[in-house]
């Protein structure tokens, strides 16, 4: 899977979309999970409604929401009040039994609010005596990483 980068501004909302083949994934619930470590598991953040027919209903877990357009074949995840610690590698998944197919690998990047000069990422440069933690992700809006290239490790 290629990895698609979604960039959002700290404090704002970020919408991540994961298109899929609606016929192939007919009847399947979906999930949004966060990759833990290079070879670690993908930890479930939120999943669609237990009843597949009600997948269009938005479900929240904390500041993360998920909704599924099963007819159009688009899973949408909303990250509200985006924070630097939200940056990292995620997956949109299609669930079947105890198995999960990856619909899309997503790299979430959190950009500093240009009006907010707190330490929130790679966009601003602090004073001489300070430094900021490098985001350790590849950068570009709506860019897919090259096949086989893994943008790891993410900032957690």
């Amino acid at each position: 899977h290629n990895t698609t980068v979604f960039q959002g501004v700290a404090g704002q909302s970020l919408q991540v979309s994961c298109p899929y083949d609606s016929m192939k994934h007919w009847g399947r619930r979906k999930a949004w999970c966060r990759q833990l470590g290079e070879k670690g598991p993908c930890q479930r953040v939120v999943s669609t409604h237990n009843l597949w027919l009600l997948s269009f209903l938005r479900r929240w877990n904390g500041s993360t929401a998920i909704t599924d357009d099963t007819l159009g074949g688009t899973l949408t995840i909303t990250l509200r009040n985006l924070q630097p610690h939200d940056a990292g590698l995620y997956q949109c998944q299609s669930l079947h039994g105890s198995e999960a197919d990856t619909l899309r690998k997503v790299l979430v990047e959190v950009l500093a609010d240009p009006l907010d000069h707190r330490d929130a990422g790679d966009l601003w440069f602090p004073g001489e005596s300070e430094s900021f933690e490098d985001a350790h992700v590849e950068h570009s809006i709506s860019r897919s990483l090259l096949e086989g290239e893994i943008p790891f490790p993410p900032t957690s």
């Epitope: 990292g88 790679d122 440069f125 900021f132 490098d134 350790h136 290239e149 790891f152 900032t155 957690s156």
Partner: antibody, heavy 123, light 112 residues
Framework: QVQLVQSGAEVKKPGSSVKVSCKAS????????MNWVRQAPGQGLEWMGR????????NYAQKRQGRVTITADESTSTAYMELSSLRSEDTAVYYC????????????????WGQGTLVTVSS | GVVMTQTPLSLSVTPGQPASISCRTS???????????LHWYLQKPGQSPQLLIY???NRVSGVPDRFSGSGSGTDFTLKISRVEAEDVGVYYC?????????FGQGTKLEIK
């Protein structure tokens, strides 16, 4: 194979500018940070800044900010470092260095370096 | 920025003998993702620097196993188990956990 080929040596007058180029080949230029590091005669290495060619994002060392401009041309896979208002203490060898992207087993270090460009600032 | 202090600044070693270089940093290099981005470079006379070890202890392909890196947090060490003539040059520690990236002052290794 990965190669970074830099432009030739330059002799400049104080107050002028210099633009050093770094032509990359053998890898996806757009998706790796390119760094510029300098080394004054007999001194250590000093990081000047970096650019992500895919979107032009840059970071600079605070010390040099304002005098250094790092750019990249994706069409020719070439990165540039321009240093303005040159002073004698800017006499140094300037290196471009690719930042190895974060793949499993490899990580965020400068794995390929150009051959260096000597910039001499003298009146 | 992160200040990196290398010791010693110069080292004269008999071939076949071990050598050790220390690198201390002004703040922890552990990234919030758990990784430590401390690297070692060697600059041989008249050459560009070359990457030897990345992420504290990972040898670059082609680097002899007599080179090893260790450490954590703010305290790191590069060891050469048996120095050879081709190892001469200046060794630099460097960090890429935080921007701006920084280098140590360098340690010059000479052969006795």
């Amino acid at each position: 194979q990965v190669q970074l080929v830099q432009s030739g040596a330059e002799v400049k007058k104080p107050g002028s500018s210099v633009k050093v180029s770094c032509k990359a080949s053998g890898y996806a230029f757009s998706s790796h940070w390119m760094n510029w590091v300098r080394q004054a005669p007999g001194q250590g290495l000093e990081w000047m800044g970096r650019i992500y060619p895919g979107d032009g994002q840059t970071n600079y060392a605070q010390k040099r900010q304002g005098r250094v401009t790092i750019t990249a041309d994706e069409s020719t896979s070439t990165a540039y470092m321009e240093l303005s208002s040159l002073r004698s203490e800017d006499t140094a060898v300037y290196y471009c260095a690719r930042l190895l992207r974060n793949q499993p087993g490899e990580s965020y270090a400068m794995d390929y370096w150009g051959q260096g460009t000597l910039v001499t600032v003298s009146s | 920025g992160v200040v990196m202090t290398q010791t010693p600044l110069s080292l004269s070693v008999t071939p076949g003998q071990p050598a050790s270089i220390s690198c201390r940093t002004s703040q922890s290099l552990v990234h919030s993702n758990g990784y430590t981005y401390l690297h070692w470079y060697l600059q041989k006379p008249g050459q560009s620097p070359q990457l030897l070890i990345y992420k504290v202890s990972n040898r670059v392909s082609g680097v002899p196993d007599r080179f090893s890196g260790s450490g954590s947090g703010t305290d790191f060490t590069l060891k050469i188990s048996r120095v050879e003539a081709e190892d001469v040059g200046v060794y630099y520690c460097s960090q890429s956990t935080r921007v701006p990236y920084t280098f140590g002052q360098g340690t010059k290794l000479e052969i006795k």
